[in-house]
């Protein structure tokens, strides 16, 4: 029998005893003679065993055999067997059957030779092989009764040496992650999804994360596949912060010289065309009209003042048409028009006077008479003993259709140093002083000024049925905007359809929504889809030209002659243009400088534009005085200059 080192060591002591085995056999003969065939004393037994321990073990048991089976002379075979077995301490076997290889009989003792993995006197104790050097296992060691087993963590497999572990590459199985990307890891794997997606182990697919459920946005959130966008209340003067989640105020980046002159009277405040000032003169003493004032405008058409009575009686209206003074008058129901003098809508101050002389009306510009009109009677009308005259500034007190020749009464102009009927009445001055909206900008330039809190809109048509093609409807939107912005965010122009759907918009924005990048851009969009973007140095105080051209199969955006970058595929573009074409055949309003109260998500920008702007649409310059509606704070033909801050 070959024994392993451990067993050999265990056997070392008993093996030395085994050298006396011949003596053991002789001893068995002596025992039979001395104690089986006849009764032996303890001393005689001592002589047989030649040692005390075995004797001490044997003798009491010997006596027990006699008690049980009678004395030797009784010749009970059971007695002989009983005595013969007493020295063999392995009978019955005291060792644990499971853990013992063999039992060694010793003198009055025994030795259990244990199998591998067992220990203890009776070989009944399991040896924990794992307690020493993990049983030689590279990862997991499982102790078992009389044995042990190496195992591997999940994701590893046990090698042929039954001890080493090797990583399993789960990614070799294409089904491991389904649609997702599989990444092998030591003992594991990970199913990866693009940013904005999360892995569903159940479906084995990448599913969109709804970031809007996570309250990422301060105001409005729109979830999209793999992403989300935050929107801020542009009409409320807010835009996205650099973190693209929170909102911040839209603040001017270019300072405009907004100072007002308290001694001036702004004529363009009322878009309705109603007068900004109404004066009622009444005299007991017959009086003649004398109106004198300094005047400044870039506006080619509008009403400076009206003086007289009812629309069907006697009155005069001093206005501007094509930049020249025009006097409309009606005396006792008979109407006339006179126009003369230089072009005066050059934006510089000039003194204008209208004086009622004996039988004439004399109009002067800078003290030079430009019109002298013979009239029959006075403007003051005698009623119930009193002479009456109504005087309105910046508008007329009746319908435009009641004029001799209709005129657009709206006039973006400014008056100062006025004198009505040699009047010393401070009422107008006091009223103007208390109301800044009645005052003019101290300095103005050409253009239209959008203060960032209102819009104008027009009812324009963008489609036409070409006669040569029959009923084929062609359409085009050509916009040229000359802008000098004060802020980096705002709608320049937009087409709005039924139910306030923003069909098309051209706007300034300070971020790239898909790249989530802060950048000053002009965006051209159909509804909420950006078609093209172009960078613009919006805060450089310079005038920039934004050109937009849309027609079948084409959408271009240019800033200062440089073409913008398309943001959509050819197919997407065509789809958007088809949609636009269809919508243009319905009712469309052209919004300038802002939008109505649409949803912030319906278009890239909802904020009002702030700054100077002149617009050309399909080859025609838009006159804000001819708009269907204009916010009263927008100045239609004048713009404050950029404030040049000296360091």
């Amino acid at each position: 029998v070959l024994l392993r080192a451990r067993e050999a060591a265990q056997f070392l002591r008993p093996r030395q005893r085994r050298a006396y085995q011949v003596f053991e056999e002789a001893k068995q003969g002596h025992l039979e003679r001395e104690c089986v065939e006849e009764v032996c004393s303890k001393e005689e037994a001592r002589e047989v065993f030649e040692n005390d321990p075995e004797t001490d073990y044997f003798y009491p048991r010997y006596q027990e055999c006699m008690r049980k089976y009678g004395r030797p002379e009784d010749k009970n075979p059971n007695f002989a067997t009983c005595v013969k077995n007493l020295p063999d301490q392995c009978t019955p076997n005291p060792c644990d059957k499971k853990g013992t290889q063999l039992c060694q009989d010793l003198m009055g003792n025994f030795f259990c030779l244990c199998k591998d993995g067992w220990g203890g006197r009776l070989c009944d104790k399991d040896v924990n092989e794992c307690s020493q050097k993990n049983g030689g296992c590279s990862q997991v060691c499982h102790n078992k009764p009389g044995s042990f087993q190496c195992a591997c963590h999940s994701g590893f497999s046990l090698q042929s040496d039954n001890k080493s572990c090797q990583d399993i590459d789960e990614c070799t199985d294409s089904d491991t992650c389904g649609d997702a990307r599989c990444k092998n890891l030591p003992g594991s794997y990970s199913c990866l999804c693009d940013k904005g997606y999360t892995y569903s182990s159940k479906e084995k697919t990448c599913q969109d994360v709804d970031e809007c459920q996570q309250d990422r946005c301060e105001q409005t959130c729109v979830n999209s596949p793999g992403s989300y966008t935050c929107h801020c209340n542009g009409r409320g003067g807010l835009k996205l912060s650099p973190d693209m989640d929170t909102c911040e105020d839209i603040l001017p980046c270019v300072p405009f010289s907004m100072a007002k002159s308290v001694k001036s009277l702004y004529l363009g405040r009322m878009f309705s065309g109603t007068p900004v000032i109404r004066l009622r003169f009444k005299r007991l003493q017959p009086t003649r009209l004398l109106a004198e004032f300094d005047f400044r405008t870039f506006d080619p058409e509008g009403v400076l003042f009206f003086a007289g009575g009812r629309s069907d009686s006697t009155w005069i209206v001093l206005g501007l048409r094509a930049g020249r003074l025009e006097l409309q008058l009606r005396y006792n129901g008979v109407g006339r028009i006179t126009s003369s003098g230089p072009t005066i809508n050059h934006g510089m101050w000039q003194t204008i006077s209208v004086e009622e002389l004996d039988r004439n009306l004399v109009i002067k510009v800078n003290k030079d008479a430009v019109m002298k009109i013979a009239v029959a009677g006075g403007l003051f009308q005698l009623e119930r003993g009193l002479y009456h005259l109504n005087l309105t500034v910046g508008g007329i007190p009746f319908k435009e259709s009641d004029l001799v020749q209709p005129i657009n009464p709206r006039l973006d102009g400014c008056m100062r140093s006025w004198n009505w009927l040699n009047g010393e009445d401070s009422a107008i001055q006091e009223t103007v002083k208390a109301n800044t909206k009645m005052q003019c900008f101290s300095v103005t330039e050409r253009g239209s000024f959008f203060p960032g809190n209102g819009f104008a809109f027009y009812s324009l048509n963008y489609t036409r049925t070409s006669l040569d093609v029959g009923t084929e409807t062609t359409w085009e939107v050509e916009v040229v905007a000359r802008i000098r912005p004060a802020t980096d965010t705002g709608v320049l122009m937009a087409l709005v359809g039924d139910k306030d759907v923003v069909l098309l918009s051209v706007a300034l924005v300070d971020y790239h929504s898909t790249k989530k990048l802060k950048k000053q851009l002009v965006v051209l969009a159909v509804e909420n889809v950006a078609l093209a973007l172009m960078e613009i140095k919006v805060c450089d105080s310079q005038e920039h030209t934004v050109t937009v051209s849309l027609r079948d199969g084409e959408a271009t955006l240019e800033v200062d002659g440089t073409k913008g970058q398309s943001e959509v595929s050819t197919a997407q573009l065509q789809e958007r243009l088809d949609l636009l074409k269809t919508r243009l055949q319905g009712s469309v309003l052209t919004f300038v400088g802002g939008l109505p109260d649409v949803q912030v998500t319906s278009t890239p920008v909802t904020a009002f534009y702030r700054g100077c702007m002149t617009l050309e649409v399909n080859g025609k310059t838009l006159d804000l005085d001819t708009a269907s509606y204009k916010h009263s704070d927008i100045t239609s033909h004048s713009c404050p200059p950029v404030e040049h801050v000296t360091a």
Epitope: F281, K282, G385, L386
Partner: antibody, heavy 116, light 107 residues
């Protein structure tokens, strides 16, 4: 600034004549007519009439026709009210007021007391 | 001649109270009604001119309304400095006629 300055108070006997002055400054005198208003002690205001400062033509209300006369000295930008044959009921404060259909600018008033 | 009937002839109010004075004309005068304040020893002061127009420098607690024949003058939150006589004047036709006046006193 526009000012209307009237002459001082007068104590007169019934039957006498009094002439009150009203000097205008701060505006073109002939552009506005001049009104006269009477206020008896503890009583209300009564419009007496007016004078055209261009032509000098006076206009009187019915109650003040006869003994009352409005006049001008245009060069002195002054208007006058003369009351002849004074009566006790003429005791009052007399105001001049510039014509604007209504009255914005007033003189400080001249108290005429008629007492035997 | 257009006669003007003013009421009440006098009234007494506590500081902070509202005052209402009424003038009724015998003919339709549109909105050609004016309102004056007169303090003892002073000439009348125009507060509100035709068309219910508050004159420059007059506090906004004074207001008026009315058209045709019925006119109302109001003082909101009366102050002690408002103690005076108040008159209405119609300037629709000659002769110009005043109301008899209202004496305002403080309680």
């Amino acid at each position: 600034q526009i000012q209307l300055v009237q002459s001082g108070p007068e104590l007169k006997k019934p039957g006498e004549t009094v002439k009150i002055s009203c000097r205008a400054s701060g505006y073109t005198f002939t552009n506005y007519g001049m009104n006269w208003v009477k206020q008896a002690p503890g009583k209300g205001l009564k419009w007496m009439g007016w004078i055209n400062t261009n032509t000098g033509e006076p206009t009187y209300t019915e109650e003040f026709k006869g003994r009352f006369a409005f006049s001008l000295e245009t060069s002195a930008t002054t208007a006058y009210l003369q009351i002849n044959d004074l009566k006790n009921e003429d005791t009052a404060t007399y105001f001049c007021a510039r014509d604007e259909g209504w009255f914005v600018y007033w003189g400080q008033g001249t108290l005429i007391t008629v007492s035997a | 001649e257009t006669t003007v009937t003013q009421s009440p002839a006098s009234l007494s109010v506590a500081t902070g109270e509202k005052v209402t004075i009424r003038c009724i004309t015998s003919t339709d005068i549109d909105d050609d009604m004016n309102w004056y304040q007169q303090k003892p020893g002073e000439p009348p002061k125009l507060l509100i001119s035709e068309g219910n127009t508050l004159r420059p420098g007059v506090p906004s607690r004074f207001s008026s309304s009315g058209y045709g024949t019925d006119f109302v003058f109001t003082i909101e939150n009366t102050l002690s400095e408002d103690v005076a006589d108040y008159y209405c004047l119609q300037t629709d036709s000659v002769p110009l006629t005043f109301g008899a006046g209202t004496k305002l006193e403080l309680k």
